[in-house]
Interface confidence: low
């Protein structure tokens, strides 16, 4: 028996359902009584879901997995993972045994989009050219870690005096805070781009300083 899986990682959004595709080619006359199907975590060998002795043995992994029982006889051994969490990320092995056996691994990459960045300024009044200001760009509840880029009004990257920190909450999602320290010109726009490297999602925030008032 030959097992086939997707070579590309499966990307799943947090709290959605993901399908880890796995298939095999059944011989003529194949019956489910012959099938032993095991899904396990590749690294730790922890059992996730199994089908043995002609029946679905159910989920061994937080009761959030399911097979496609009507499609098994056609060679579809895919696994449905419900309400995906950050901690589900990793490699899963699909192990199929009929008379002989084969296995293959598929990777699950979890992702969550970042919120539109909020911008804060310190100090936020009585600003004059030549003043040093601190601009903070904050974006929330994303995964995985964001990449943060700063640019001025002409699109020129600002790389000096940038400090970025990331904090994971109990669900493993990240809040990102990036701080730019800059000397004010006569006026100017400062933009922050928060990029999710998996989703290729960009979230933009900007602040324009033109004397008073400030524009966010």
């Amino acid at each position: 028996v030959e097992v086939q899986v997707s070579e590309d990682p499966v990307v799943a959004l947090v709290d959605t359902d993901a399908t880890l595709r796995c298939s095999f080619s059944p011989e003529p006359g194949f019956s489910l009584a012959q099938l032993n199907l095991i899904w396990q975590l590749t690294d730790t060998k922890q059992l996730v879901h199994s089908f043995t002795e002609g029946r679905d043995q159910g989920s061994a992994y937080s009761n959030r997995t399911a097979l496609f029982p009507d499609l098994l006889v056609q060679g579809n051994a895919s696994l449905r993972l419900q309400r995906v969490r950050v901690t589900d990320e990793g490699s899963y092995t699909c192990f199929v045994s009929i008379q002989d056996f084969d296995s293959a691994a598929v990777s699950l990459q979890v992702a969550a989009p970042y919120s539109k960045p909020s911008m804060t300024l310190e100090p936020n009044k009585d600003l004059r050219p030549g003043n040093m200001v601190t601009i903070t760009c904050s974006s929330y509840q994303g995964y995985p870690e964001a990449e943060v880029f700063w640019k001025d009004g002409q699109g020129v990257p600002l790389t000096g005096n940038v400090t970025t920190s990331q904090m994971a909450n109990e669900r493993g999602l990240f809040d990102v805070h990036s701080v730019l320290r800059v000397v004010l010109g006569a006026n100017g726009t400062y933009s922050c781009l928060v990029r999710n490297p998996v989703l290729q999602q960009d979230a933009h925030g900007s602040v324009t300083i033109t004397g008073q008032p400030l524009t966010f």
Partner: antibody, heavy 122, light 108 residues
Framework: EVQLLESGGGLVQPGGSLRLSCAAS????????MSWVRQAPGKGLEWVSG?????????YYADSVKGRFTVSRDNSKNTLYLQMNSLRAEDTAVYYC??????????????WGQGTTVTVSS | EIVLTQSPGTLSLSPGERATLTCRAS??????LAWYQQKPGQAPRLLIY???TRAAGIPARFRGSGSGTDFTLTISSLQSEDFAVYYC??????????FGGGTKVEIK
């Protein structure tokens, strides 16, 4: 075989500079976050710096090295670098590079190099 | 920055005995905690991640537990190759990633 190999350590005077390299093999280097961790003689582990996956990605530093050390990577050469300037006696340590166990993320390091020794002394 | 405090500093035990190492975080790190083993002259080796998941190839005698601020690494029956220094590391809030000060497990 997944492997990391550091080089570039040596003896340098206070105020001097050194550039460490970490050559990666056996895995898709560009997919993984990388870190530098050091260990002073007889002391524990101290995270020094880390860099995310893309060329223009985020670099992070411990307060003790911020403004003096610069981490970078060349994905085409499968190599991680640590440029160390304005070195001090307290930077004397074995420097390890480490690969995160999961792409796109700082978590825990499942692959480590053998370390390269940096000695700062006059 | 999150500070990790490991205790005891040194644990003197005989082969076959049970070792219990603790790691306490200055604030909650959820289960974003790893344990490493380091032998003299060698690089650290990842034992446990996610507070309780054994890394690939790590024997079942190593067990991690805990969440929030209090964590334990238990070695159920010490083998000669287990005598080493053990470090915990958090990865909930960074930078910086932080390590505990280490616990040395030595032969009694």
């Amino acid at each position: 075989e997944v492997q990391l190999l550091e080089s570039g350590g040596g003896l340098v005077q206070p105020g001097g500079s050194l550039r460490l390299s970490c050559a990666a093999s056996g895995f898709t280097f560009s997919d993984y976050y990388m870190s530098w961790v050091r260990q002073a003689p007889g002391k524990g582990l101290e995270w020094v710096s880390g860099i995310s996956i893309s060329y223009g990605g985020n670099a992070y530093y411990a307060d003790s090295v911020k403004g003096r050390f610069t981490v970078s990577r060349d994905n085409s050469k499968n190599t991680l670098y640590l440029q160390m300037n304005s070195l001090r006696a307290e930077d004397t340590a074995v420097y390890y590079c480490g690969r995160d166990r999961s792409p796109y993320q700082y978590r825990s390091m499942d692959v480590w190099g053998q370390g390269t020794t940096v000695t700062v002394s006059s | 920055e999150i500070v990790l405090t490991q205790s005891p500093g040194t644990l003197s035990l005989s082969p076959g005995e049970r070792a219990t190492l603790t790691c306490r975080a200055s604030q909650s790190v959820g289960d974003f905690l790893a344990w490493y083993q380091q032998k003299p002259g060698q690089a650290p080796r990842l034992l446990i991640y996610g507070a309780s998941t054994r890394a690939a190839g790590i024997p079942a005698r190593f067990r991690g537990s805990g969440s929030g601020t209090d964590f334990t690494l238990t070695i159920s029956s010490l083998q000669s190759e287990d005598f080493a220094v053990y470090y915990c590391q958090q990865y909930k809030n960074w930078p910086p990633l932080t390590f505990g000060g280490g616990t040395k497990v030595e032969i009694k």
